[in-house]
């Protein structure tokens, strides 16, 4: 309803005109164009693509399109000294070596500059020792090993399967356990869906396929050498020893054919339970070391990658707002890929390209959005969200004053089953209303709305008749905007059926087999799911930039705050005796949530009734909505994580990809029964309850009548 009420909107130039201009065929064409060669961050090929996108966005009609460059720490394998892992015999002879590259997919045999599989930012080293299998290398896996099984990983090389949690958390956990090296592998239990063929005959991971990826623990810092500040021409850079988040032990990824050779010889303890077994024909013994006949053999890693300060390029396009040019709605996604980027990121970049083209078409016909829209093609996302973070650090003062919303646009698909949305509660109603107006692309839902198919296939666990919307975690470019700056953020993509497909991510994630053909043959031949994602992302941007009253509903924040308070309280109540002993009370938090609920309700009533023709009052009300997300930011940040400043949400300390609610309290309570000083530990719980209660109350007050 709100869009075509905007002052400069004629009936022709409404949301429908924007959506109708989006074409599946264009997205397909753009995806093909973006995926013919690798676009690794820091390479000439990715610089050329940045310039191409800059040129095309200008042609599409944006007001300005600039490149923003930064010199950041990246990591590459040594071209003449490849990384690999060996099994060595008692004489030190290498009797087995893992492969040096993935067999290239058909049609790509002669492509140069395919970076071999590596773990970005691994230090150099050639550790050798006994192997310990650590399952997914999650916090709970190491608890099981160390506490229950009494297995010591100190001085061992650990082998962990990919999946469940961000790989950087796995490496951090292994380091803390005293390991001297980490081997990461893709188990078919997680990366091979039953009944589907391996690429190129299907979308499953072949045995020689390997997942690349960074293994940093940046906690939102951006460039490891310039935390908090842009990596510009006059930047002061830390020494490598003081760099943020770098791993201290060598790490290397392998495929399941190579993993089979390492795991089949494992001896020592049997796996503790079936959850430690994958799908390979190996015992999944934990170790340490190899069994009987092979007990004198060891594993040796050979890692020679180098960290290098390298120039990266963001593309920033501007479509100036007609009424509120100083209010920014941002649509951003990354451009850099590990290899061809068939899904990650180019399925997202192609959608952004088509959204820009559609907005440009409207602008050429005389239309402008109410608010300014910024479009971003980020660089070096794969190396730690570096491009987006450096740009946000450089522009933080503008963003914190003018940033209305950030919509992320990485991979448009990770499956073709249903929609998946993660966003701030402020956007729930926007997403609901928008998806009710869009057609579902799903088979069996012809003529039905996207909302209907999404709700049917992915129902909310709390509210019947509504779809699941998840918390924002991290591992993508919205991180700096949401977790550091407190700008309302959201993301949407098409996903798999999580019920039937238990594998992690999509099987060919970050492998050489993530090609255009993977998408065109197996995931989305008609590009109808891409088009739907373009409509959702583009539609959200359109509404956020164009509606007279910002499409945020603060009452939805009140609902989730109560849910999160209940959840953290019940976690704490697992320790009733200690809560009594140390006088731990959640009363202040529940009181603050109650106040927030009441004030949000009153604010919503005023929002319905105020005089929208009064630009000052309109701006005032919109500012209260815009700054609500900002009000959840604690300038001091979370303990030991200064760039995670949102008090309601943060990436889980155990899995960067997952969002945690009331993270300060959650972390203070985590494993509290094992703390050496319970008094101090419970004191920190109380402090975190205080911080959370204060923040919720302070946020509530920003919604009160101003005078």
């Amino acid at each position: 309803k709100s869009s075509n009420e905007a002052t400069n909107i004629t009936p022709k130039h409404n949301m429908k005109a924007f959506l109708d201009e989006l074409k599946a065929e264009n997205i397909k064409k753009f995806l093909y164009n973006f995926t013919q060669i690798p676009h690794l961050a820091g390479t000439e090929q990715n610089f050329q693509l940045a310039k191409q996108i800059q040129s095309q966005w200008k042609e599409f009609g944006l007001d300005s399109v600039e490149l923003a460059h930064y010199d950041v720490l990246l990591s590459y394998p040594n071209k003449t000294h490849p990384n690999y892992i060996s099994i060595i015999n008692e004489d030190g002879n290498e009797i087995f070596n893992t492969s040096l590259f993935e067999p290239p997919p058909p049609g790509y045999e002669n492509v140069s500059d395919i970076v071999p599989p590596f773990s970005a930012f691994s230090p150099q080293g050639m550790p050798e020792g006994d192997l310990v299998y650590v399952n997914y290398a999650r916090t709970e896996d190491f608890f099981k090993l160390e506490r229950d099984m009494k297995i010591n990983c100190s001085g061992k090389i650990v082998i962990a399967r990919y999946g469940k949690v961000f790989r950087g958390n796995k490496v951090k956990n292994a380091q803390l356990a005293g390991a001297k090296g980490v081997i990461l592998y893709s188990d078919p239990a997680d990366y091979f869906a039953p009944g589907v063929k391996s690429y190129p005959d299907g979308w499953n991971l072949p045995g020689g396929g390997v997942q690349r990826g960074n293994i940093l623990n940046l906690n939102g810092a951006g460039d490891p050498l310039t935390p908090g500040y842009p990596a510009n021409e006059y930047a002061y850079r830390r020494g490598i020893a003081e760099a943020v988040g770098l791993p201290s032990i060598p790490v290397h990824p392998i495929g399941y054919y190579d993993a089979q050779k390492l795991l089949e010889k494992m001896g020592g303890s049997a796996p503790p339970d079936s959850s430690w077994r994958g799908s390979l024909k190996v015992p999944y013994n934990v170790g340490p070391g190899f069994t009987g006949n092979f007990s004198t053999q060891k594993v040796k890693m050979h890692i020679h990658s180098t960290n290098e300060v390298t120039r990266i390029y963001n593309v920033i396009g501007t479509l100036r707002g007609a009424v509120e040019p100083d209010r920014y709605v941002i649509l951003g996604g990354h451009r850099d890929s590990w290899v061809f980027g068939g899904i990650d990121p180019q399925s997202g970049a192609a959608v952004v390209h088509e959204i820009v083209r559609s907005f440009g078409t409207l602008k050429k016909e005389g239309w402008r959005p109410r608010r300014t829209i910024l479009f971003a093609s980020w660089d070096a996302e794969e190396f730690g969200l570096l491009g987006s973070t450096e740009w946000a650090e450089e522009n933080s003062r503008l963003l914190q004053e003018r940033g209305v919303a950030y919509i992320n646009a990485d991979s448009s698909i990770e499956g073709n089953y249903t929609l998946r949305v993660d966003c701030t509660p402020l956007m729930y109603s926007l997403v609901h209303n928008l998806t009710k107006e869009l057609k579902s692309p799903d088979e069996g839902f012809e003529g039905k709305s996207l909302y209907e198919s999404w709700t049917k296939k992915s129902p909310s666990p709390e509210f019947s008749g509504m779809p699941r919307i998840s918390k924002l975690g991290s591992g993508n470019d919205f991180e700096v905007f949401f977790q550091r700056l407190g700008i309302a953020s959201g993301r949407a993509r098409y996903t798999k059926n999580w019920e039937t497909n238990k594998f992690s991510g999509y099987p060919l994630y970050h492998s050489v087999y993530e090609t255009y053909e993977l998408v065109e043959k197996f995931y989305d031949p008609m590009f109808k799911y891409h088009l739907t994602v373009a409509q959702v992302r583009g539609g959200m941007v359109f509404e956020l930039a164009n509606s007279i009253v910002l499409p945020f509903d603060c009452r939805d924040y009140a609902v989730v705050l109560r849910k999160y308070a209940d959840k953290i309280y019940s976690i704490s109540m697992k320790h009733p005796q200690e809560m009594k002993t140390y006088s731990v009370s959640f009363d202040s938090l529940f009181s603050a949530v109650k106040n927030f609920t009441e004030i949000a309700s009153k604010f919503s009533e005023r929002l319905q009734d105020f005089d929208k023709s009064n630009p000052i009052v309109l701006r005032m009300m919109n500012d209260q909505l815009m700054f609500l997300e900002r009000a959840f930011i604690d300038p001091l940040g979370l303990p030991d994580r200064p760039f995670y400043r949102h008090v309601i949400y943060a990436p889980s300390s155990h899995n960067k990809y997952a969002g945690e609610s009331f993270p300060g309290i959650y972390d203070a309570l985590f494993d509290i029964e094992s703390k050496v000083d319970p008094s101090k530990a419970w004191g920190e719980v109380k402090r975190q309850i205080y911080v959370a209660a204060f923040t919720v109350q302070a946020a509530a007050e920003t919604l009160s009548e101003v005078a």
Partner: antibody, heavy 120, light 111 residues
Framework: QVQLVQSGAEVKKPGASVKVSCKAS????????INWLRQAPGQGLEWMGG????????NYNENFKGRVTLTIDKSTSTAYMELSSLRSEDTAVYFC?????????????WGQGTLVTVSS | DIVMTQSPLSLPVTPGEPASISCRSS???????????LHWYLQKPGQSPQLLIY???NRFSGVPDRFSGSGSGTDFTLKISRVEAEDVGVYYC????????FGGGTKVEIK
């Protein structure tokens, strides 16, 4: 496509040795074990042993231990089976077969077979 | 070693009719990882064996869907829903959970 090509038929005297080759192509040789099996005239299949080209590790059927030796030449992607102290009951067709890795873990590609005749 | 026992030894069939072959192992074929590595091969006259079914019930590439496998633990069955002339040959069950062993074979011939 995956191919296993075996050497030609052999006639041997009792007490002699025979060495059969199996040249692999169409896949990464080091990823897949090679099994050797035999089939006596009108009989079923009998597994003799297997070798892993990746590390040279071998497994032998107890019935053949000491008489069979499996080797590989990575440079030519060739596997070899040598059977010594031949006797007339060793007359059989000898097959090499690739041990399919995940998800098969079955012998998914076979050589054409090599007839070895042991006769005085 | 695991002993694999197939029945019947010989199976005369009429084209278009179904056929069923049974295979029993001397001990469980369930691997510690939960998978059962029981496979079926067909050796056509004068040819090398070829893989038909792997891990009990999965058809290998190019195998017609008239072939199906089932069973668990120690008892397994291969079924041909409608026998065709080209299906003649000797069918072997085999296990690779332990040291590989084969059944004695079932000769399928047209009546």
């Amino acid at each position: 496509q995956v191919q296993l090509v075996q050497s030609g038929a052999e006639v041997k005297k009792p007490g002699a040795s025979v060495k059969v080759s199996c040249k692999a192509s169409g896949y990464t040789f080091t990823y897949f074990d090679i099994n050797w099996l035999r089939q006596a005239p009108g009989q079923g299949l009998e597994w003799m042993g297997g070798i892993s080209p990746g590390d040279g590790n071998t497994n032998y059927n107890e019935n053949f231990k000491g008489r069979v030796t499996l080797t590989i030449d990575k440079s030519t992607s060739t596997a070899y089976m040598e059977l010594s102290s031949l006797r007339s009951e060793d007359t059989a067709v000898y097959f090499c077969a690739r041990d399919g890795n995940f998800p098969y873990y079955a012998m998914d590609s076979w050589g054409q077979g090599t007839l070895v005749t042991v006769s005085s | 070693d695991i002993v694999m026992t197939q029945s019947p030894l010989s199976l005369p069939v009429t084209p278009g009719e179904p056929a069923s072959i049974s295979c029993r192992s001397s001990q469980s074929l369930v691997h510690s990882n939960g998978q059962t590595y029981l496979h079926w091969y067909l050796q056509k006259p004068g040819q090398s064996p070829q893989l038909l079914i792997y891990t009990v019930s999965n058809r290998f590439s190019g195998v017609p869907d008239r072939f199906s496998g089932s069973g668990s633990g120690t008892d397994f069955t291969l079924k041909i829903s409608r026998v065709e002339a080209e299906d003649v040959g000797v069918y072997y069950c085999s296990q690779s959970t332990h040291v590989p062993t084969f059944g004695g074979g079932t000769k399928v011939e047209i009546k």
